[in-house]
Interface confidence: medium
Amino acid sequence: GITIPRNPGCPNSEDKNFPRTVMVNLNIHNRNTNTNPKRSSDYYNRSTSPWNLHRNEDPERYPSVIWEAKCRHLGCINADGNVDYHMNSVPIQQEILVLRREPPHCPNSFRLEKILVSVGCTCVTPIVHHVA
Amino acid sequence: GITIPRNPGCPNSEDKNFPRTVMVNLNIHNRNTNTNPKRSSDYYNRSTSPWNLHRNEDPERYPSVIWEAKCRHLGCINADGNVDYHMNSVPIQQEILVLRREPPHCPNSFRLEKILVSVGCTCVTPIVHHVA
């Protein structure tokens, strides 16, 4: 296996007071049997609210690299291929669970963490505020 | 905390052979500090590719309830509020990590699992296949 420099403050896995700690088998099971999880999705280019993917790296987290969607335009692409600013491109966000080494550098002690990621963009009608 | 009927076949958390098992602290830390993940996002109604949210519940999974997006139309909503079938509403899908009790009903033994969820919908230009 891997040799990881061990933090002397790593919790004792048998410590009954280690808060809300459970055993997790990390042989990740894939339930995506009926679908194709790695389908070739080019929606980010074909969408009327296209997006680019930006890299976010954190070596203490699994997955270590998260690619985040950033909408390319404030507006949406119209039928002529131009940006229509009467509509808005907005990110669709979703919370995902990640594992974080805690304390850092402990080889098999983790904390579950929720982070919000932008998955893609959608085109919405703007909310117009009329000034009296 | 919650009392879960214990399966007598639950693995021994001290078993050194319990495969790829780590200690995970389930006091979930929320990193979404700069954003408001519980903001009232009405994008699902305002999008040109609107969607409905369907509840998927599984008591043996964490999180137990996952809301899945289903696109309302095959086409997209145009400026007149009608469905334009020259464009396609498609789901934006994302893999998420969840925890599944394994074996079932064991209070503190889980397996990490990947599932594919639809987060929202976006409007894309269709791929047109020209027949020779």
């Epitope: 296996g1 990881i4 999880p37 270590s64 690299v65 690619w67 990621v117 998955v119 | 987060v119």
Partner: antibody, heavy 126, light 107 residues
């Protein structure tokens, strides 16, 4: 850009063991895995096994199970592949390859080889 | 294990011509199919990941398509530097496997 530099060519006798190193630089070691792939002379590519650096998991192809050991040392950012009980069939070029550990385009992308070492030529002959 | 069968085994092509290489999987693998290029005496290089996504720095003349069991690598307007052996690789199930390779040379 991650660079993988492998140890030099080796000549071994049947029955001996082999240990090839793969030194990674230019990226954070924990954020990817390392797989080992070999190529016999004039033949195609064959996956032997790999290690996920973040967890220290290893996976091996059944064909090599019990004969191959893959390890990694985070402090030196080096992965190792040890193969025992060598025969002439093990004569090949051995490559290490980087496996990303990414959440990409909505998916956990952790299973292709985006960067390769230069290869280590191993000859097994009596 | 999942067997990948490439065709053709060998292709001799003139520059500017279009090259199509197919890879068939013995079972459904979604889009967990990747393509590599290996030039003589060099290490393999990733071209396409997940059936259709180009790796960074790969010229736009290379493209991939397909899902399920049938996949295609296309080189539009072949250049002399594209002479190499091309391998498909599946990562849907362990052990990871490769196709037998398709050698492309320039006429």
């Amino acid at each position: 850009e991650v660079q993988l530099v492998q140890s030099g060519a080796e000549v071994k006798k049947p029955g001996e063991s082999l240990k090839v190193s793969c030194k990674a630089s230019g990226g954070r070691f924990r954020t990817y895995g390392i797989s080992w792939v070999r190529q016999a002379p004039g033949q195609g590519l064959e996956w032997m096994g790999g290690i996920t650096n973040f967890f220290g998991w290893t996976d091996y192809a059944q064909k090599f199970q019990g004969r191959v050991t893959i390890t990694a040392d985070e402090s030196t950012t080096t992965a190792y592949m040890e193969l025992s009980g060598l025969t002439s069939d093990d004569t090949a070029v051995y490559y290490c390859a980087r496996v990303p550990n990414e959440f990409w385009n909505g998916y956990y992308a952790t299973d292709y080889f985006d960067n390769w070492g230069q290869g280590t030529t191993v000859t097994v002959s009596s | 294990e999942i067997v990948l069968t490439q065709s053709p085994d060998f292709q001799s092509v003139t520059p500017k011509e279009k090259v199509t290489i197919t890879c068939r999987a013995s079972q459904e693998i979604g889009a967990s199919l990747h393509w590599y290029q290996q030039k003589p005496d060099q290490s393999p290089k990733l071209l396409i990941k997940y059936a259709s996504h180009s790796a960074s720095g790969v010229p736009s003349r290379f493209s991939g398509s397909g899902s399920g069991t049938d996949f295609t690598l296309t080189i539009n307007s072949l250049e002399a530097e594209d002479a190499a052996t091309y391998y498909c690789h599946q990562s849907d199930g362990l052990p990871y496997t490769f196709g037998q390779g398709t050698k492309v040379d320039i006429k």
